[in-house]
């Protein structure tokens, strides 16, 4: 399954929107910085097959979409930018979903790397718990916004590797 070029453009647009969503200076939130343990090895496109990488990408985008679809998120961000950002993610999910469905239908496809899915889920659990702990403060959201920009950048790199594998 070939991800359309528009998928990468969408990812870049999502990153730009996320950058624009910043409301406060990151420097005023230095005391709130946190290492969420982004599972970088899951974004090493050479580590596993394309079909598995697409499942990991889907999980990453889906969890990001869910994170920014909460009521707490709606209260934290400028509404029109948040809606545009969510729309970009939703479009990416549709592209990835079509690919995963195609792979699921092929019986020779190897089993999904479930530990990679779990690693992504745990990463977002750490982010969720951090926000809860910090009571969804503006600085907590700013730290999370910066972290998601980082994780989306990693997923962009993974997509580039996947296209080279075609």
């Amino acid at each position: 399954c070939d991800l359309p070029q528009t998928h990468s453009l969408g990812n870049r647009r999502a990153l730009i929107l996320l950058a624009q969503m910043g409301r406060i200076s990151p420097f005023s939130c230095l005391k709130d910085r946190h290492d969420f343990g982004l599972p970088q090895e899951e974004f090493d496109g050479n580590q596993f097959q394309k079909t598995q990488a697409i499942s990991v990408l889907h999980e990453m985008i889906q969890q990001t979409f869910n994170l920014f679809s909460t009521e707490d998120s709606s209260a934290a961000w400028e509404q029109s930018l948040l809606e545009k950002f969510s729309t970009e993610l939703y479009q990416q999910l549709n592209n990835l979903e079509a690919c995963v469905i195609q792979e699921v239908g092929m019986e020779e496809t190897p089993l999904m790397n479930e530990d990679s899915i779990l690693a992504v889920r745990k990463y977002f659990q750490r982010i969720t718990l951090y926000l809860t702990e910090k009571k969804y403060s503006p600085c907590a959201w700013e730290v999370v916004r910066a972290e998601i920009m980082r994780s989306l950048s990693f997923s962009t790199n993974l997509q580039k590797i996947l296209r080279r594998k075609d």
């Epitope: 499942s55 889907h58 889906q62 969890q63 979409f65 869910n66 679809s69 999910l93 990835l96 979903e97 995963v100 469905i101 699921v104 999904m112 479930e114 530990d115 779990l118 889920r121 745990k122 977002f124 659990q125 750490r126 969720t128 718990l129 809860t132």
Partner: antibody, heavy 119, light 108 residues
Framework: QVQLQQPGAELVKPGASVKLSCKAS????????MHWVKQRPGQGLEWIGE????????IYNENFKSKATLTVDKSSITAFMQLSSLTSEDSAVYFC????????????WGQGTLVTVSA | QIVLTQSPAIMSASPGEKVTLTCSAG???????LYWYQQKPGSSPKLWIY???NLASGVPARFSGSGSGTSYSLTISSMEAEDAASYFC?????????FGSGTKLEIK
């Protein structure tokens, strides 16, 4: 609000199969993995597996791989679990539960379907 | 798979009494992925405590959770009649996800 609706009971004969349903409402069905859990009378809970309704990928507990098959129908926002070659060991209540994170992990459960395997 | 052992299997407590239920894991579980559920007869389980020590919405403040590694506990500071139920610990730190066999808590 989030709801997961399951039929109350199913009576099936040994050796037969049964397909249990879990109809979701109150949230975007394709955004969250759906899990299935078994509970024998007066016993603990056993995780059977999960399915991502968005694309149909499944992850199973090895103990249930040859027993359960998880599927979804996006058009009717319903998750299904087929149990095959039923024996008395399969008589139990089967719950569906929605995934999520933090305070949303297994925060929503169906009422459970009691499966009775009897001749 | 990670086996979760709960003790005691059944216990009874008087109103006002302090109660501690334990959950022992066969191998280490990260505290972020250790949860507790309450279940009453004829009902589905209810999320009670998430990530070891956080109370789910609507759970009374007399409940608390603690632990790390292989040893976890749920404590009720002052038992009330409505707390009579079964309590299950659960881990999703690694596949397959597992539950404890449960502790049935009765009121004296």
């Amino acid at each position: 609000q989030v709801q997961l609706q399951q039929p109350g009971a199913e009576l099936v004969k040994p050796g037969a199969s049964v397909k249990l349903s879990c109809k979701a409402s109150g949230y975007t069905f394709t955004n969250y993995w759906m899990h299935w859990v078994k509970q024998r009378p007066g016993q603990g809970l056993e995780w059977i597996g999960e399915i991502n309704p968005s694309h149909g990928r499944t992850i199973y507990n090895e103990n249930f791989k040859s027993k359960a098959t998880l599927t979804v129908d996006k058009s009717s926002i319903t998750a299904f679990m087929q149990l095959s070659s039923l024996t008395s060991e399969d008589s139990a209540v089967y719950f569906c539960a929605r995934g999520g994170l933090g305070p949303a992990w297994f925060a929503y459960w169906g009422q459970g379907t009691l499966v009775t395997v009897s001749a | 798979q990670i086996v979760l052992t709960q003790s005691p299997a059944i216990m009874s407590a008087s109103p006002g009494e302090k109660v501690t239920l334990t959950c022992s894991a066969g191998s280490s579980v990260d505290s972020s992925y250790l949860y507790w559920y309450q279940q009453k007869p004829g009902s589905s389980p209810k999320l009670w405590i998430y990530s070891t020590s956080n109370l789910a919405s609507g759970v009374p403040a007399r409940f608390s959770g603690s632990g790390s590694g292989t040893s976890y506990s749920l404590t009720i500071s002052s038992m009330e009649a409505e707390d009579a139920a079964s309590y299950f610990c659960h881990q999703w730190s690694s596949y397959p996800f597992t539950f404890g066999s449960g502790t049935k808590l009765e009121i004296k």
